[in-house]
C-alpha cells in the first residue's frame, strides 16, 4: 500500500516494520541450552529496530506476524558426531516467556551435516521472548556469516 | 598477554595416573574452548582433548577415550588433564592450547610444554 | 578420521629462496577448515595461517597459504633465517581434529 507523505517521514518503528538481526555472543554455562545473542552496529552487521534484547534472548515490542529465521553452524562438529559419537544435536526456536505462551515454533535436527537453517510465519506479541536451545555437545560457530537468528515483522 | 603454563609432568610408571594442570593469564578464560595436544619424542602432533569454554561439552580422541579426563575451574583461570592408566605410548610433550575465539579448533596461542614420561 | 599427508618431509632450501609445502586430505576438509603451524626446536608450536589462506595475527606476508577441499599449500616467498623450521598442517573441520607429520625446511 502507499504511504502517505506524513507517513513516510516517521521512523520504521512507528509503522511497525519492527526487524532484528542477531550474532552468537556465547553458549549458556552448564546445564543451560540456550544460546546467547547480541545486536549493534558497533558488533558488524547485527542490529535491533524494535525488537530488544533481554539477558541475551530477543524480545519482541509489536504484535503481528513475523518472519523468524535462524542459521546455525556447528564448529566443532564430525561427519559422524552427530549421530554416532554424541547425542544427537539439535536446534529449537521457541517463545520461553510468558509462560503462559511458551510454545516450539521451530525444531532442526543436525543430522549428518554441521550447518542447519531455516524460518518461518509465526504470530508473536508484545512480550514475547524467544529463546534458542541448542542441545548435545557440539559448539556453535560465533563466526558472524555462518550463526545468525532474526525477526522481520511482516503485517499486523 | 595470552600466558598458558603447564605442570604437572613427570615420570611415571605404567598404569599409574598423573594429572596435568594449565595455568592461564591475559584473557577471558571461560569464554575460550581449551584442548591438550601432545608431541612424542621425535613424531607428529596428536590432538588429545578438548572442552568447552563453560566445561558443559568435552571430546577425547579414541586412543584415550575413557582414560584421561579434561576439566577446568573458570575461578581459577586453569585448565585440567587426568591421566589414568597410563601406557608407554602416552610417553609426550603435552601441551595446553587456546581456540580461536569463534569455537575453532585451531589454536592461536599454546603453552611451552609439560613432559610426561611412562616408564618402567 | 581426516589423514593428512605433508610433503616433502624435508626441504633444503637457502635463504632468499620460495618454499612450497604441500598438505594433501584423505577426504575432503570442511570449508577449508585447515591451519598451518611453525615450530621450532624446544618450542611450542606458533599459528600461521587458519582457514587455509588468513594469515594469524603478526605473521608477515610472506607466508601465504591456498588451497580448498583435499589439497592445500603453505608458501614462503622469501625465506629467512628464522623461518628454518617444522611445519604442521591441522584440519579442525571434522573431529577428530588431525595434523600431518611436518615439513622440515632447512638451511641448504
Known amino acids: 500500500q502507499r504511504l502517505s507523505r506524513a507517513q513516510q517521514q516517521l521512523p520504521l518503528e512507528s509503522l511497525g516494520w519492527d526487524i532484528a538481526e542477531l550474532q552468537l555472543n556465547h553458549t549458556g554455562p552448564q546445564q543451560d541450552p540456550r544460546l546467547y545473542w547480541q545486536g549493534g552496529p558497533a558488533l558488524g552487521r547485527s542490529f535491533l529496530r524494535g525488537p530488544e534484547l533481554d539477558k541475551g534472548q530477543l524480545r519482541i515490542r509489536r504484535d503481528g506476524i513475523y518472519m523468524v529465521h535462524i542459521q546455525v553452524t556447528l564448529a566443532i562438529c564430525s561427519s559422524t558426531s552427530t549421530s554416532r559419537h554424541h547425542h544427537p544435536t539439535t536446534l529449537a526456536v521457541g517463545i520461553c516467556s510468558p509462560a503462559s505462551r511458551s510454545i516450539s515454533l521451530l525444531r532442526l535436527s543436525f543430522h549428518q551435516g554441521c550447518t542447519i537453517a531455516s524460518q518461518r510465519l509465526t504470530p508473536l506479541a508484545r512480550g514475547d521472548t524467544l529463546c534458542t536451545n541448542l542441545t548435545g555437545t557440539l559448539l556453535p560457530s560465533r563466526n558472524t556469516d555462518e550463526t545468525f537468528f532474526g525477526v522481520q515483522w511482516v503485517r499486523p | 598477554e595470552v600466558q598458558l603454563l603447564e605442570s604437572g609432568g613427570g615420570l611415571v610408571q605404567p598404569g599409574g595416573s598423573l594429572r596435568l594442570s594449565c595455568a592461564a593469564s591475559?584473557?577471558?578464560?571461560?569464554?575460550?574452548?581449551m584442548s591438550w595436544v601432545r608431541q612424542a619424542p621425535g613424531k607428529c602432533l596428536e590432538w588429545v582433548s578438548t572442552i568447552s569454554g563453560s566445561g558443559g561439552s568435552t571430546f577425547y580422541a579414541e586412543s584415550v577415550k575413557g582414560r584421561f579426563t579434561i576439566s577446568r575451574d573458570n575461578s581459577k583461570n586453569t585448565l585440567y588433564l587426568q591421566m589414568n592408566r597410563l601406557r608407554a605410548e602416552d610417553t609426550a610433550v603435552y601441551y595446553c592450547?587456546?581456540?580461536?575465539?569463534?569455537?575453532?579448533?585451531?589454536?592461536?596461542?599454546w603453552g611451552q610444554g609439560t613432559l610426561v614420561t611412562v616408564s618402567s | 578420521e581426516i589423514v593428512l599427508t605433508q610433503s616433502p618431509g624435508t626441504l633444503s632450501l637457502s635463504p632468499g629462496e620460495r618454499a612450497t609445502l604441500s598438505c594433501r586430505a584423505s577426504q575432503s576438509v570442511r570449508s577449508s577448515y585447515l591451519a598451518w603451524y611453525q615450530q621450532k626446536p624446544g618450542q611450542a608450536p606458533r599459528l600461521l595461517i587458519y582457514g587455509a589462506s588468513s594469515r594469524a595475527t603478526g605473521i608477515p606476508d610472506r607466508f601465504s597459504g591456498s588451497g580448498s577441499g583435499t589439497d592445500f599449500t603453505l608458501t614462503i616467498s622469501r625465506l629467512e633465517p628464522e623461518d628454518f623450521a617444522v611445519y604442521y598442517c591441522q584440519q579442525y573441520g571434522d573431529l577428530p581434529f588431525t595434523f600431518g607429520c611436518g615439513t622440515k625446511v632447512e638451511i641448504k
Open positions: 591475559g584473557f577471558t578464560f571461560s569464554v575460550y574452548a
Open positions: 592450547a587456546r581456540h580461536d575465539y569463534s569455537n575453532y579448533a585451531y589454536f592461536d596461542y
